[in-house]
């Protein structure tokens, strides 16, 4: 409640998160008639990457495109891009939606179509659907340990969230520990009213929020934080229009002295922790 | 029509080696991945090599490093060089046409898309 007589200040908040959970993966590649059938282990290096700001991210599902190579090649064929003869390709063209740079020859994709010839990473990137259901689906059971430091200047008080008592095995429930600060993703979705399984195929953003109401007079001092969660990327995009959450990344390997790359389109959820909030004194 | 001639079976003793040769005719290999799949006496038949319509190979762990499977320029033949040949080797041996799957060192028929087309097998004997 609004204690007008009250001096109030906002919150100022650092965060750390430490993500943990194993996930054992089985993925099917299908190419030239044969599907080959992958078993791997992702730990904690395998599915996050440090982000900026007070976010992290969880890889959730993932497109391989292997042993890609710095060399000649056409195209894929997406919509717009094949060619009958040289005429429709241009010699150094970079077109946006390709993955290299045009020699200026029309050459053979497969045995039907045909597309221009570029120099980029080959063979070029085709475009798959995300697998479903996603490839670490069971990144649901994966917890997060959130760590909020709070800072009030003007009141010269600071706190956070996680306190001495705290049990490091606890999980956070809204009824039965509300103030534990270990998170299970699976949870914070059904917190959200969202559908892990679903979002993890495409990928989403989740916004963990925590709010501090505190109240900093010695008489009735209280400053615990309540932690809310809700979606915060727009789930009724169109299809066709870049939905989810998802970006690409390399791995670089020799082989046979000659320079190659894994390229990985990662989908996932990205978390984003949005800390508010007020400390009162009179 | 699909056929598939094997060619080079025999007998050759322990440590010995073997080509046999698999004549395709009624298709090219860019249509479909090529396999050699064993049956020995009394035990099931099983996958010993792959070579997909791309050119990637893929062998059973039980003959990694002793067999190789390659093609003729012209993509017509597939061959199966078999080295440092054991007597648990004995068995006919055929060429497959068709889908396969590959799992850790394990190779099988892709049943979902089809039986495939089998040669009629050539005999592999390896004493000791």
């Known amino acids: 409640s609004d204690k007008l007589y009250q001096r109030k200040e906002p919150v100022i908040s650092s965060v750390h998160t430490k993500v943990k959970g194993i996930a054992e993966v089985t993925e099917n590649v299908t190419e030239g008639g044969v599907t080959k059938l992958g078993h791997s282990i992702f730990d904690t290096a395998d599915y996050t990457f440090p982000l900026q700001g007070n976010s992290f991210f969880v890889m959730t599902n993932y497109v391989k495109s292997e042993g890609q190579v710095q060399t000649l090649c056409p195209e894929y064929p997406r919509r717009g891009a094949q060619c009958s003869s040289d005429r429709r390709c241009k010699k150094g063209w970079m077109d946006p939606q390709s993955k290299g740079i045009q020699t200026g020859r029309c050459v053979p994709y497969d045995k039907t179509r045909k597309t221009c010839e570029v120099s980029a990473w080959c063979p070029t990137e085709e475009e798959k659907e995300a697998p479903r259901p996603a490839l670490l689906r069971s990144a649901e059971n994966f917890t997060v340990l959130i760590k909020n430091n709070i800072h009030f200047p003007g009141h010269n008080y600071t706190t956070r969230n996680i306190l001495p008592t705290m049990n490091g095995s606890c999980t956070f429930h809204k009824t039965w520990d509300p103030q534990c600060s270990i998170f299970r993703l699976g949870d914070i979705f059904q917190e959200a009213g969202e559908n892990f399984t679903e979002v993890a195929v495409q990928g989403g953003i989740m916004g963990i929020e925590i709010y501090w109401d505190c109240n900093l007079d010695s008489w009735s001092h209280h400053c615990r934080p309540r932690y809310s969660f809700r979606r915060l990327d727009d789930k009724n995009t169109d299809e066709s229009f870049v939905p989810g959450y998802n970006f690409r990344y390399a791995k670089y390997y020799k082989e046979n002295n000659v320079e190659k790359r894994t390229l990985i389109k990662a989908f996932g959820i990205r978390f984003d922790i949005l800390v508010f909030g007020t400390g009162g004194k009179f | 029509e699909v056929q598939l001639v094997e060619s080079g079976g025999g007998l050759v003793q322990t440590g010995g080696s073997l080509r046999l040769s698999c004549a395709a005719s009624?298709?090219?290999?860019?249509?479909?991945?090529i396999a050699w799949f064993r049956q020995a006496p009394g035990k099931e038949r099983e996958g010993v090599s792959i070579?997909?319509?791309?050119?990637?190979?893929f062998y059973a762990d039980s003959v990694k490093d002793r067999f190789s499977i390659t093609a003729d320029g012209a993509k017509t033949t597939v061959f199966l060089q078999m080295n440092s040949l054991k007597p648990g080797d004995t068995a006919i041996y055929y060429c497959?046409?068709?889908?396969?799957?590959?799992?850790?060192?394990?190779?099988?028929?892709?049943?979902?898309?089809?039986?495939?087309?089998w040669g009629q097998g050539a005999q592999v004997t390896v004493s000791s």
């Open positions: 009624g298709f090219t290999l860019d249509d479909y991945a």
């Open positions: 070579l997909s319509s791309i050119g990637k190979t």
């Open positions: 497959v046409a068709g889908h396969f799957v590959y799992n850790d060192g394990a190779i099988s028929l892709n049943t979902a898309r089809g039986s495939g087309f």
